[in-house]
């Protein structure tokens, strides 16, 4: 029994004065607590507690369930205990079948013994199955058997407490170990779409998927910079043990422009948190924005190819697209496709492929697109660069030599005189008159230039060259002169192509 120095309060004393007492089933338990400030007896076993305000605890016919710790407490809060075993060969174990374990922690299989003198107190697997090799345990007859460092793999493990009694193995009723997993990573969160574009009045619905080892993972939808509670609906599944999935669906049945913003799906567990966001843009009506991928004024050489390319944003989806030239709609030579296969894609590409363009095919090419809300168009002005062509070269009645050339860009006409039989015409002749004529063809066609010189200036035999040129190339026409006396005679003019 405890002893303390005089003057200090001392713990109560218990009779019989031993820490453990063994009685047989059916015998009397008589425990006396001696203390001037006696308060109560408390009995504890498994998950039960009982109290008695008498200083003598008497149980006339002891049962196995009277096995447990009897504690006497005085008014100073000091206490003393005795543990009583009620030996019952028919009930060797007291059992609380509730058995939970937290991963990586110890857990107690509560099967205290009624007889401390039995041997080989241990755990056994159900139906003769062996226990996991790494399962370690420590038996304590008064409390049960402590499993050390519970593993996730022990979940749903079926166990018995076991003792040897008179050479035979006796098993308790079965226990099923339920392991609560430790969170060793943050939840995995994903969202159905990263961005949403809606018209006013349309329904906004977005789903966040949360995956974790347990359904105790916390999740919520939040609006950034807002404390307003959002309405969510949930679906959840257990895909086997420690593989839990929740879908949290946020819905705004009729979205308004001021609902636009960033929404965050947030999840956390005891390890940490994770989040994912989605952006909602609500517009009052649909739109189409066209972006040319090349300059809208296009210059192309005769016979070459050009692609007219536009990208455009269309919401809602485009319904009609067409390319038009000279009031005619192209039925082929163009393609239209989404910029990406992403479900939320609103960007599209349209390409018109113009091949081996002729000088007569310059002009305005227009792309038109529409959806249920708006129409939009963009025009490309296509100019076909052509080498000059000399349309006419004549000696006029007034003695003028005239050269008319067409091409794009606008040709320049230079005149040269070659005296006698020389092949190279180098002496330039200044024109008397230069005019740009209006073409009778379509706009964006060739430009026509007329240039004239006075032939009376030439006094010797020779050749006059009219040379028309631009960025693409050059072409020449020639006038041959021969003098007979005072008469000047025009020999047939001819052209020479100069690359």
């Amino acid at each position: 029994q405890p002893s303390v120095s005089p003057g200090e309060p001392s713990p109560p004393s218990i009779h019989p004065g031993k820490s453990d007492l063994i009685v047989r089933v059916g015998d009397e338990i008589r425990l006396l607590c001696t203390d001037p400030g006696f308060v109560k007896w408390t009995f504890e076993i498994l998950d039960e507690t009982n109290e008695n305000k008498q200083n003598e605890w008497i149980t006339e016919k002891a049962e196995a369930t009277n096995t447990g710790k009897y504690t006497c407490t005085n008014k100073h809060g000091l206490s003393n205990s005795i543990y009583v075993f009620v030996r019952d060969p028919a009930k060797l174990f007291l059992v609380d079948r509730s058995l939970y374990g937290k991963e990586d922690n110890d857990t107690l299989v509560r099967c205290p013994l009624t007889d401390p003198e039995v041997t080989n107190y241990s755990l056994k697997g159900c139906q003769g199955k062996p226990l996991p090799k790494d399962l370690r345990f420590i038996p304590d007859p008064k409390a049960g058997i402590m499993i050390k460092s519970v593993k996730r793999a022990y979940h749903r493990l079926c166990l018995h407490c076991s003792v040897d009694q008179e050479g035979k193995s006796v098993l308790s009723e079965k226990f099923i170990l339920k392991v609560r997993p430790a969170f060793k990573a943050v939840p995995v969160v994903s969202v159905s779409k990263a961005s949403y574009l809606l018209r006013e009045g349309e329904e906004f619905t977005v789903t966040c998927t949360i995956k974790d080892v347990s359904s105790s993972v916390y999740s919520t939808w939040k609006r950034e910079n807002s404390q307003t509670k959002l309405q969510e609906k949930y679906n959840s599944w257990h895909h086997g043990d420690f593989n839990y999935e929740r879908q949290a669906t946020l819905t705004i049945s009729s979205a308004r422009v001021n609902d636009s913003g960033v929404f965050m799906c947030y999840a956390n567990n005891t390890f940490g948190s994770a989040n994912v966001t989605t952006t909602l843009e609500v517009v009052d009506k649909g739109f189409i924005n066209i972006f040319p991928m090349i300059n809208t004024t296009v210059f192309v050489n005769d016979g070459e190819n050009v692609d007219l390319i536009v990208e455009y944003e269309a919401f809602p989806k485009p319904e009609h697209q067409q390319w038009i030239y000279m009031n005619r709609t192209f039925t082929d030579k163009w393609e239209d496709y989404p910029k990406s296969e992403n479900e939320s894609n609103i960007r599209y590409v349209s390409e018109l492929h113009l091949t081996r363009l002729k000088g007569t095919e310059g002009g305005t090419y227009t792309f038109l697109v529409s959806n249920s809300d708006v129409n939009a168009a963009i025009a490309f002005n296509v100019y076909v660069n052509t080498k000059p062509e000399i349309l006419t070269y004549d000696r006029l009645v007034n003695g003028m030599l005239q050269c008319v050339a067409a091409g794009f860009p606008e040709p320049t006409i230079d005149w040269y005189f070659c005296p006698g039989t020389e092949q190279r015409c180098s002496a330039s002749v200044l024109p008397v008159d230069v005019q740009t004529l209006n073409s009778s063809g379509p706009p964006f066609g060739k430009l026509v230039v007329q240039s004239s010189i006075d032939s009376s200036a030439f006094k010797h035999n020779g050749t006059v060259e009219c040379k028309a040129y631009n960025d693409v190339g050059k072409t020449s026409a020639y006038f041959n002169f021969a003098f007979k006396g005072n008469n000047k005679e025009q020999i047939h003019p001819h052209t020479l192509f100069t690359p």
């Epitope: 498994l46 507690t49 509730s98 939970y100 099923i176 339920k178 105790s216 839990y244």
Partner: antibody, heavy 118, light 107 residues
Framework: QVQLVQSGAEVKKPGSSVKVSCKAS????????ISWVRQAPGQGLEWMGT????????RYAQKFQGRVTITADESTSTAYMELSSLRSEDTAVYYC???????????WGQGTLVTVSS | DIQMTQSPSSLSASVGDRVTITCRAS??????LAWYQQKPGKAPKLLIY???SLQSGVPSRFSGSGSGTDFTLTISSLQPEDFATYYC?????????FGQGTKVEIK
Amino acid sequence: QVQLVQSGAEVKKPGSSVKVSCKASGGTFSSYAISWVRQAPGQGLEWMGTIGPFEGQPRYAQKFQGRVTITADESTSTAYMELSSLRSEDTAVYYCARGGYISDFDVWGQGTLVTVSS
Amino acid sequence: DIQMTQSPSSLSASVGDRVTITCRASQSISNYLAWYQQKPGKAPKLLIYDASSLQSGVPSRFSGSGSGTDFTLTISSLQPEDFATYYCQQYYYESITFGQGTKVEIK
């Protein structure tokens, strides 16, 4: 023997919240899960959620997720269930029970009648 | 979530009759099934756990069987105090579901 003793009947207005308590006596509290189950008049049993064993966040039935909050105070061996945004169909007897983490319910509270009426 | 379907929803029987109630799970729940008895105005009372284990203090006329998806509660000889509503409950995962109940009435 462990007993679960619940708080008394409540009458609440639609849109308000109710908090029901469940005190364990005659035993320890921390090594068990505590669950909440409700029963509307003339209807069956409906699991709402479970807290414990050990520390950590509760687990809720998806029907009540976001509207129910289950907490526990080990120092007083008391569990609580709070249900918000009450509507008339939440009128029911609310029970606490011992167990529920992959286990049956071996001990039940006496039940708390919550009436939601305007 | 796992759905539990009980049948019949009600039955009439006499004292001494053998009564069988069945419960079917929408997916396998091994033997993680309990049976409860509830009388009007009272909390449910656990009868059977782990499909076939009799809860302490419950009369031996109650028995449970089954595994996987199909389960049975049997009352071998119905007593007057057994007229009540019986519920099955699965607890295979953290999410728990009950059957809709079977009311046992006096014929």
